[in-house]
């Protein structure tokens, strides 16, 4: 997260760290007791590694009573996700067992009504991704409030040049932005999961390259079918 602040500890009990061989790889969001939603591209280079999900964490390194690392029983990328596009960049991870719920571990309601979030709406994005252009990684969860950007502006030639489909949404990125390591994390508007940080190699913090988020409402049928 660029230009954000340290989050209040455990105030986002849905927040997950998707880990590869014990190190933070991507963000994720607990959407059901045994399921974490993240981004498909996160697992592209994880073929031989051990993927796990950390729940109940604020600090990645410090011991915390609520922290627990779960093995992954099944990883389900969206069937249409492809390495070279940002489209359909969703991944569902089934935990080896149901998460132990509590004040610091709780699923987040996700948007099912397929309607765009109004431009200007302030949404919260959180993650353990890099906090500056030098690539510094934080130990504790960071967050930032970002206004939603209308699709027409986001699709300008100077911005994302038509790449933002109806299944994607944008948020402003002027010095405050999600970045490398935040992919798969939640964009939360009004207490509801609206988007998932896409995992392309987009420049961060540049006003002309808004943050791109996969709209979960557009994938409600797929999410329901996997969770069923």
């Amino acid at each position: 997260i660029l230009g954000g602040r340290e989050a209040e500890a455990h105030a986002r009990p849905y927040m997950a760290s998707v880990q590869l061989n014990g190190a933070h790889l991507c963000g994720g969001v607990l959407v059901a007791e045994q399921w974490v939603l993240s981004a498909a591209h996160c697992l592209e280079d994880a073929a031989d590694g051990k993927v796990q999900v950390l729940l109940g964490a604020h600090s990645l390194s410090q011991p915390e009573p609520s922290k627990r690392l779960y093995d992954v029983l099944r990883a389900v990328p969206h069937p249409d996700s492809q390495p070279d596009t940002i489209d359909h960049d969703l991944l569902l991870l089934q935990l080896s067992e149901k998460a132990t719920l509590g004040p610091a571990v709780r699923p987040l309601p996700w948007q099912r009504v397929d309607r765009d979030v109004a431009p200007g709406t302030l949404c919260d994005v959180a993650g353990w991704g890099i906090v500056n252009h030098a690539g510094r990684r934080p130990d504790s969860l960071q967050h930032v409030l970002l206004p939603v950007l209308d699709r027409a502006t986001c699709n300008r030639a100077t911005h994302h040049d038509g790449a933002i489909t109806e299944r994607l949404m944008c948020a402003e990125s002027n010095r405050r932005d999600s970045c490398k390591g935040d992919s798969g994390g939640p964009l939360v508007c009004g207490g509801v999961l609206e988007g998932v940080v896409t995992s392309g190699s987009r420049v961060c913090g540049n006003a002309k390259k808004p943050g791109i988020y996969t709209r979960v409402a557009s994938y409600a049928a797929w999410i329901d079918s996997v969770l069923a």
């Epitope: 302030l122 409030l145 206004p147 009004g190």
Partner: antibody, heavy 118, light 107 residues
Framework: QVQLQQPGAELVRPGTSVKLSCKAS????????MHWVKQRPGQGLEWIGV????????KYNQKFKDKATLTVETSSSTAYMQLSSLTSEDSAVYYC???????????WGQGTSVTVSS | DIQMTQTTSSLSASLGDRVTISCRAS??????LNWYQQKPDGTVKLLIY???RLHSRVPSRFSGSGSGTDYSLTISNLDQEDIATYFC?????????FGGGTKLEIK
């Protein structure tokens, strides 16, 4: 405790500009955002914009984009708002208000009354 | 921009009364609603943030409730020092916007 000090009044000529100050004390200046709010006589409140003193990041209400410029001077823990091309419509009380990372304005200055008159 | 409407511009009540001030948003603001008190001398204070959370050092006789587009501020036991104008403000969408205010007077 948190205090935001603003001058009581400014009398300015039409067409000129004025720079209003808001001196903060009782907290770490860079840890709170600073909002500016306008109130015309007998009217409601209008949000002008906000600045993050830690890096001077600003967000403006489009209505005031060409009217107001927000700056900070961290060495003196002071926030400023410059109002340009003043007209009678700009005669109002202007408040600074601290915090509000989440949009709440937790601590308010006393307000500066700006009168635009020839 | 989101319009915030306080339909009652002035309200008269007796000391000790329970007073409710309402505020309506032109669209769902997901509980991102704050209440402010402005005294006759112009002093402004935050009373309640995020619909129902009491700001520090605000008396417990103040409470807030609501959801979606409709919100209210309640003063349970009206005190002389509560004579003021009360404004609601939405923090869901930029630009932040305020209601027109409700002026509370003593009968």
């Amino acid at each position: 405790q948190v205090q935001l000090q603003q001058p009581g009044a400014e009398l300015v000529r039409p067409g000129t500009s004025v720079k209003l100050s808001c001196k903060a004390s009782g907290y770490t200046f860079t840890s709170y955002w600073m909002h500016w709010v306008k109130q015309r006589p007998g009217q409601g409140l209008e949000w002008i914009g906000v600045i993050d003193p830690s890096d001077s990041y600003t967000k403006y209400n489009q209505k005031f984009k060409d009217k107001a410029t927000l700056t900070v001077e961290t060495s003196s823990s002071t926030a400023y708002m410059q109002l340009s091309s003043l007209t009678s419509e700009d005669s109002a009380v202007y408040y600074c208000a601290g915090n509000g990372y989440d949009g709440s304005m937790d601590y308010w200055g006393q307000g500066t009354s700006v009168t635009v008159s020839s | 921009d989101i319009q915030m409407t306080q339909t009652t511009s002035s309200l008269s009540a007796s000391l000790g009364d329970r007073v409710t001030i309402s505020c309506r948003a032109s669209q769902d603001i997901s509980n991102s609603l704050n209440w402010y008190q402005q005294k006759p001398d112009g002093t402004v204070k935050l009373l309640i943030y995020y619909t129902s959370r009491l700001h520090s050092r605000v008396p417990s006789r103040f409470s807030g409730s609501g959801s979606g587009t409709d919100y209210s501020l309640t003063i349970s036991n009206l005190d002389q020092e509560d004579i003021a104008t009360y404004f609601c403000q939405q923090a869901n969408t930029l630009p932040y916007t305020f209601g027109g205010g409700t002026k509370l007077e003593i009968k």
